[in-house]
């Protein structure tokens, strides 16, 4: 039993860290493997994560690691029975993948604009709450060439969109993802798309 690609881990920096690795042959991850993890701090408990299969030979483990602080480092050990396959360490603050923004909604707004709103996926208590910036992708459902990307670098999870920048009568979909620049994070997963009809008519037609 061998590890082909060693575990790669990311933390949402609030409740969960996820590690994924690839074995050298198809493996029943939950039956054959265990990932043990322990905060590298005197007196910390040793925990065991039972991995699941993502693909035939790809295993994934979700570990409840909450209230992470910057200095936290976890010792990880991957076991196949009594055999230690891999040993390493993981610092959640250096491997952040933010949670997905939620509840993306589109509202008609004053003066021919659309207001896109979503929720910050972190409570105020969390260190990431005030650190997120967002990317919004707006695409025409019937024209793959007609898409726009907006970077929302201010604090509020909102974007105002002039209806005139979109094709009149076309159906558009938007989705949003987040990242934490100060943590040099990866991007979050995209939110589910929300769709609306752009019924703006150019002024000359009136």
């Amino acid at each position: 039993v061998k590890v082909l690609h060693e575990p790669s881990c990311f933390s949402d920096y609030i409740s969960t860290s996820v590690c994924q690795w690839k074995m050298d042959h198809p493996t029943n991850c939950s039956a054959e493997l265990r990932l043990s993890y322990q905060l590298d701090f005197m007196g910390s408990e040793n925990h065991t994560c039972v991995p699941e299969n993502r693909e035939d030979s790809v295993c994934v483990c979700s570990m409840p690691i909450d209230d992470a602080v910057e200095a936290d480092v976890y010792q990880l050990d991957l076991w196949a029975g009594q055999q230690l396959l891999w040993s390493g360490s993981f610092q959640p603050s250096k491997h952040v993948k933010p949670r997905t923004p939620g509840n993306l909604t589109v509202y008609p707004n004053i003066s021919h604009t659309w207001l896109l709103m979503w929720t910050n996926p972190y409570p105020t208590e969390n260190h990431l709450h005030s650190e997120l910036t967002y990317m919004v992708n707006v695409s025409n459902d019937n024209d793959p060439e007609d898409f726009k990307v907006y970077n929302v670098t201010y604090m509020g999870p909102t974007l105002r969109l002039a209806a005139s920048t979109l094709k009149s009568g076309a159906s558009y979909s938007a989705r949003v993802r987040a990242w934490a620049q100060t943590y040099n994070s990866t991007w979050s997963d995209w939110s589910p798309s929300t769709t609306w009809l752009n019924y703006y008519e150019p002024w000359e037609q009136h």
Partner: antibody, heavy 118, light 112 residues
Framework: EVQLVESGGDLVKPGGSLRLSCVAS????????IHWVRQAPGKGLQWVAR????????KYNEKFKSRFTISRDNAKNTLYLQMNSLRAEDTAVYYC???????????WGQGTLVTVSS | DIVMTQTPLSLSVSPGEPASISCKSS????????????LAWFRQKPGQSPQRLIY???TRESGVPDRFSGSGSGTDFTLRISRVEADDAGVYYC????????FGQGTKVEIK
């Protein structure tokens, strides 16, 4: 306007149990973690526990983990603190509190007094 | 656990005079990535619930007079009142939430 209203405080004998409630209004209950903080007579503030109403995830001050249980009922916008094996030193005003849209405990209830005495 | 230590524990100040309260934490409250210190200051008047005055060590809560200011970083923090008024009497607490939540013992401010 955000409001937190505690109730359930009472006089109870040592070894007894009590359940405190905190009704939240004026905001979406599931959007903010909510906490219990206590204050013994003439003493300072002590954080007890918190809950994420959305997921039900909880965290406790280790001092209270074995005797106190925090829970919530999202349908009623209500936070609870179940206190068992009460001791004289648990006599305190118990507050529920919530962060604001910025960092820190911005909103507090008026508190409810728990007295443990024989 | 992070321990918060306030000094002095009591303070008697004449109206118009400045006042200063120190708060020290047993470990740094500075997140080197966000550059924020996870420290807040509260005032509790007799018979009332605590009121947040300052967060992130130096950001004043809206509605709090600019006589109040917070400073410091890492483990040493200070709350200053530039000119004390009669209404400022009460117990002042610092609180960390860098790792869970701990309050200082409180400083009782009395107006002469």
């Amino acid at each position: 306007e955000v409001q937190l209203v505690e109730s359930g405080g009472d006089l109870v004998k040592p070894g007894g149990s009590l359940r405190l409630s905190c009704v939240a209004s004026g905001y979406t209950f599931t959007n903010y973690w909510i906490h219990w903080v206590r204050q013994a007579p003439g003493k300072g503030l002590q954080w007890v526990a918190r809950i994420d109403p959305n997921s039900g995830g909880t965290k406790y001050n280790e001092k209270f983990k074995s005797r106190f249980t925090i829970s919530r009922d999202n349908a009623k916008n209500t936070l609870y603190l179940q206190m068992n094996s009460l001791r004289a030193e648990d006599t305190a005003v118990y507050y529920c509190t919530r962060f604001g849209s910025t960092y820190g405990f911005a909103y507090w209830g008026q508190g409810t007094l728990v007295t443990v005495s024989s | 656990d992070i321990v918060m230590t306030q000094t002095p524990l009591s303070l008697s100040v004449s109206p118009g005079e400045p006042a200063s309260i120190s708060c020290k934490s047993s470990q740094s409250l500075l997140n080197s990535r966000t550059r924020k210190n996870y420290l807040a200051w509260f005032r509790q008047k007799p018979g009332q619930s605590p009121q947040r005055l300052i967060y992130w060590a130096s950001t004043r809560e809206s509605g709090v007079p600019d006589r109040f200011s917070g400073s410091g970083s890492g483990t040493d923090f200070t709350l200053r009142i530039s000119r004390v008024e009669a209404d400022d009497a009460g117990v002042y607490y610092c609180k960390q939430s860098y790792n869970l939540y701990t309050f200082g013992q409180g400083t009782k401010v009395e107006i002469k």
